[in-house]
């Protein structure tokens, strides 16, 4: 929707355009206008952009008013959220950019007799992005000034430049993303693809044989296992056995069977052979032992002279016995072969919690700290290892240690300093904890040990000009006597500044106001109305440019007057014969000065930029893609970093082209699957997906490796009549019109004999971008004057 | 208030074609996914197609893949769907619904009877 | 297809009892669930979703649990209450129900 929102409104006397007054007559002494004040509203029409703004035709893109918001003179800026001063056009376009404005204030008449009133009108061509942020334009001249604000803001979803994009967030089966200020989908945590639809899955979960339909999980297919899905699931009761696809059950190294469960190398598997027998396997779990000498038995473990092998350990003596051996073992050991420590430490001899460990018929205590000795029955002095920090002195306690602490101090080793800030510090000051004491920082604008005094900020008289002084915490204000401002009253306030006078009238500075030094063809508080010289004055024809009057403001006692048959734009020349010519000023030409010259003859907007012109200038309307006076910046498409995953980005014209990275995908390298999604191409493109890279195929009216570049087709023929300029708007245009025409093709001729432009009951004549009075008999110029 | 209407069904033989409508007012049609659900005399809700706001993401349940079609026309703030090839197990009551983060707004129905 | 059980399939209760109504997903459907109310001949209408009461629902009626079970809670059974409620999975396609709990006057 397009936002437009009154400020202010600045109509000093209550006049209206034509001079005259809101309500009634004017005061024959200050001339100035009496009764009640302007009842102010406001229209405004907004429609296609136009080089030079013509006041008729439709309000194509909408039109609103606003009720009375005011009288003469008035100020909205701090009434935030009154909708009285606001109009609000939607529309269910896409927004084209360029537009043209016409905002016009009314009286209102409060009369169903009466019409309302023009006081003052104001037109805009421009260009405006979609945003939150305010534009202000004002309108500094005529009878009344006023300032207004305007933005173009999309409805909810929508979002580019024309407010066509659509995203709405979302968090379902659709789709799990919300929208970026591009009005680009974002993935929430775990979802992947364009429509953010799909589950990443656990990390490491197999892609052939896992799946997951919520992020993080894996899911495994039939026959396959593991937090990954990648372990296939071998045949049921395999037991020495692997598999590489479901149901196998391949055997391991010396395993056999169809479960893989009969041992092949039993001799390998189990090493059954003792004392130094050799084994053969002799079949699937099956094996012999070959004893050397001196043993005997299936597995070579009955020793024929048992003591020949030292079997006793940690230097036990071996006696041989009837049945082998027997062993005595050296203090400290037991068990058959002596290999077995005593456990010392049962029963735990270490008193005061000391913890027992066992060596070799023996045991050491670890003690805690307080404990010392072999048994730790010894009280230890704490105070050897200087725990105090901030004391006088320490004393050693049984099992403990007492320290003395220093004034501020506290705690077991006295290194907590004691928090001395209980609140004595007033007026927000923060404290600051010293060792025995504390010290408070005050707030700009207090002083005192406890921040409990008001500096006093009047005491150096800072007020001028007889202003009053105000203190204030950490503050002084002047309230200044009438005719001083300024934050000391230093300023003389300037009625002049800015000036308020018109037609080049000096403007005095009086005590509470200002008064206007008019020339002599003017009059009015402002020096804004003509005098009609002729009501008082008779005037004589001198040339075909001037007509003379009696003066007493000139030596010579006349005045001399020019026609203004050369318009706006131009001076009147007398020639002989009563013939004249027109010296234009800059940037216009023809009989009248009425035509403006094209400044866009040139070409001078760079890269397929639309030259629109103005007065004695031109505006570029670049393409898509393309930025600056005269369009001559390639815009910066990687700006907002579009390549994900480690992508780089390279920026092209309207677009960008991400070069990916690590076996990533698509138009931002978004996707481990395919090159295309409903994003990678614009503008209703097809996107193929050619393995390494994708192709658009755009419909007609674009181009562009993604169709982002818009054709000239739309333009082309020129669709635009009478000299009017085109420029593309996606698969439209919108023409920009020569002055003299109007609506959507330039087709409608500009009535110029709106306003009213002949007197004293002249008939105009409307013409191309010109008009002529026929005047009724006794008058005659070339506006009947 | 939103009003969901739906329309076109009927007794059809085993084979046959049928197409449903929904007639939507009340919110920004355009703005919304919409779906359609059945419901078997004395049955449960079953899932039947859902369409994304601009139309372009479809989706369907495996009992119907191949034969139904969904759709939507914006401009006319209608939901359809082209059942083709319709067997006994489709008879049902349809409903559409307007699905944001789940269907939220359920039309009357209309019977589809399926039967030679 | 994730796989939605309601127990039980039906209840007896009376006007003022506590009702509460399970359903479990055949795998985590984190919260993404939705509860519906359907009446003899009349169209389903969302009570619940992902734990949230839908705007017009009284407060008597609340969504519990995540991942894999879920309740909805009827904190005083009222005569209007009286109808069939179904759970719904609304994270992967195909979209799948409850077979839906009867509450019946005792």
């Known amino acids: 929707q397009f936002e437009l929102e009154i400020l202010s409104m600045q109509n000093v006397n209550g006049e209206l355009q034509n001079g005259n007054c809101c309500g009634g007559a004017r005061n024959p002494g200050d001339r100035k206008c009496t009764r009640d004040e302007c009842d102010t509203y406001f229209k405004v029409c907004l429609k296609e952009y136009q080089s030079r703004v013509t006041a008729g035709g439709p309000c194509s893109f909408g039109s609103g008013s606003t009720p009375v918001i005011g009288g003469n003179t008035f100020n909205l800026k701090a009434s935030r959220g009154n909708d009285r001063n606001r109009i609000v056009l939607p529309f269910s376009f896409a927004w084209p950019r360029s537009y043209t404005l016409l905002v016009e204030a009314w009286d209102s008449s409060n009369d169903t007799v009466q019409p309302d009133s023009i006081i003052e009108k104001a037109s805009h061509s421009g260009m405006i992005n979609p945003s939150r942020q305010w534009q202000t334009l004002k309108q500094n001249t005529g009878v009344a000034h006023f300032e207004y604000q305007i933005r173009v803001t999309c409805d909810d979803y929508y979002y580019g430049f024309g407010c066509n994009k659509f995203c709405r967030p979302r968090d379902d089966f659709f789709g799990h993303y919300a929208c970026d200020q591009n009005g680009n989908k974002t993935c929430m945590e775990g979802w992947m693809g364009p429509e953010c639809n799909r589950a990443i899955c656990r990390q490491g979960c197999s892609p052939k044989h896992g799946s997951c339909k919520l992020p993080g999980d894996c899911r495994c297919q039939y026959g396959w296992q593991g937090l990954y899905c990648d372990k296939c699931i071998p045949h049921p009761g395999c037991v020495h056995g692997i598999c590489n696809e479901p149901w196998q059950c391949l055997c391991e190294t010396n395993w056999g069977g169809q479960l893989c469960d009969k041992d092949l190398n039993y001799c390998g598997t189990h090493q059954p052979c003792l004392n130094g027998g050799t084994c053969s396997n002799t079949g699937p779990d099956k094996y012999q032992c070959s004893c050397p000498e001196g043993y005997s038995g299936p597995n070579c473990e009955i020793a024929e002279h048992a003591c020949l092998s030292d079997p006793c350990h940690n230097r036990g003596s071996c006696k041989e016995t009837s049945l082998g051996f027997e062993c005595e073992c050296s203090p400290g050991w037991t068990g058959p072969t002596c290999s077995t420590n005593i456990d010392d430490c049962s029963p735990n001899n270490c008193s005061h919690g000391g913890t027992c460990q066992d060596l070799v018929n023996g045991f050491k205590c670890v003690c805690p700290p307080q404990w010392t000795g072999k048994t730790c029955q010894l009280d230890a002095n704490e105070c050897e290892a200087k725990p105090c920090v901030n004391a006088k002195s320490c004393k050693n306690l049984i099992a403990s240690y007492y320290c003395d602490c220093l004034p501020g101090w506290m705690g077991q080793n006295c290194d907590i300093n004691i928090n001395d800030c209980l609140g004595q510090c007033q007026n927000d000051a923060s404290c600051r904890d010293l060792v025995n004491g504390y010290r408070c920082i005050c707030p700009p604008g207090y002083a005192g040990d406890h921040c409990e005094r008001d500096i006093d900020e009047c005491a150096s008289n800072p007020c001028l000009n007889g202003g009053h002084c105000q203190n204030e915490i950490n503050r002084f204000q002047c309230l200044c006597p009438t005719g001083f401002s300024g934050n000391l009253c230093q300023l003389d306030i300037d009625y002049c500044e800015p000036n308020p006078c018109q037609n080049g009238a000096q403007c005095y500075n009086r005590a509470s106001d200002y008064f206007c030094k008019c020339p002599e063809d003017y009059e009015g508080k402002n020096c804004s109305h003509l005098k009609d010289h002729c009501r008082t004055t008779p005037c004589e024809v001198i040339d075909s440019c001037t007509v003379a009057m009696a003066s007493n403001d000139t030596p010579e006692g006349v005045r001399y007057i020019s026609s203004n048959v050369c318009g706006p734009h131009g001076k009147c020349k007398s020639q002989s014969g009563g013939k004249f010519t027109c010296d234009c000023n800059k940037g216009f030409t023809g009989t009248y000065c009425h035509e403006n010259i094209n400044d866009c003859e040139s070409n001078p907007c760079r890269n397929g930029g639309t030259c629109i012109d103005g007065v004695n200038s031109y505006k570029c309307i670049c393409s898509d893609g393309w930025e600056g006076a005269y369009c001559e910046t390639n815009i910066n498409d990687c700006s907002q970093n579009p390549c994900h995953n480690g992508g780089t980005c390279r920026d092209l014209v309207n677009d960008f082209y991400c070069d990916c990275k690590n076996g990533w995908k698509g138009k931002t390298c978004h996707s481990r699957d395919s090159q295309c999604d409903e994003a990678t191409c614009n503008n209703g493109g097809t996107c193929y997906d050619e393995g390494d890279a994708f192709k658009c195929m755009c419909p007609g009216g674009w181009e562009g490796t993604t169709c982002n570049i818009a054709r000239n087709s739309s333009c082309l023929p020129n669709p635009c009549h009478n000299g009017g300029t085109c420029v593309v708007n996606g698969e439209s245009f919108t023409c920009v019109c020569k002055e003299g025409w109007e609506g959507p093709i330039c087709a409608q001729n500009t009535n110029d004999c709106s306003p009213h432009p002949c007197y004293n009951s002249g008939t105009c004549v409307d013409g191309d971008n010109w008009y002529r009075c026929e005047c009724a008999p006794g008058f005659a110029g070339p506006d009947c004057r | 208030e939103v009003q969901l209407l739906e329309s076109g069904g009927g007794l059809v033989q085993p084979g046959g074609s049928l197409r449903l409508s929904c007639a939507a007012s009340?919110?920004?049609?355009?703005?919304?996914?919409m779906s359609w659900v059945r419901q078997a005399p004395g049955k449960g809700l079953e899932w039947v197609s859902s369409?994304?706001?601009?139309?372009?993401?479809?989706l369907y349940a495996d009992s119907v893949k191949g034969r139904f079609t969904i759709s939507r026309d914006n401009s006319k703030n209608t939901l359809y769907l082209q059942m083709n090839s319709l067997r006994a197990e489709d008879t049902a009551v349809y409903y559409c619904?307007?699905?944001?983060?789940?269907?939220?707004?359920w039309g009357q129905g209309t019977l589809v009877t399926v039967s030679s | 297809d994730i796989q939605m059980t309601q127990s039980p399939s039906s209840l007896s209760a009376s006007v003022g009892d506590r009702v509460t109504i399970t359903c479990r997903a055949s795998?985590?459907?984190?919260?993404?669930l939705n509860w519906y109310q359907q009446k003899p001949g009349k169209a389903p209408k969302l009570l619940i979703y992902?734990?949230s009461l839908q705007s017009g629902v009284p407060s008597r009626f609340s969504g519990s649990g995540s991942g894999t079970d879920f309740t909805l809670t009827i904190g005083s059974l009222q005569p209007e209450d009286f109808a069939t409620y179904y759970c719904q999975q609304n994270v992967a396609t195909p979209l799948t129900f409850g077979q839906g709990t009867k509450v019946e006057i005792k």
């Open positions: 009340g919110f920004t049609f355009s703005s919304y996914a």
């Open positions: 619904a307007k699905t944001s983060s789940a269907f939220d707004y």
């Open positions: 369409i994304e706001t601009q139309g372009p993401t479809t």
């Open positions: 795998q985590s459907i984190s919260s993404y």
């Open positions: 992902a734990s």
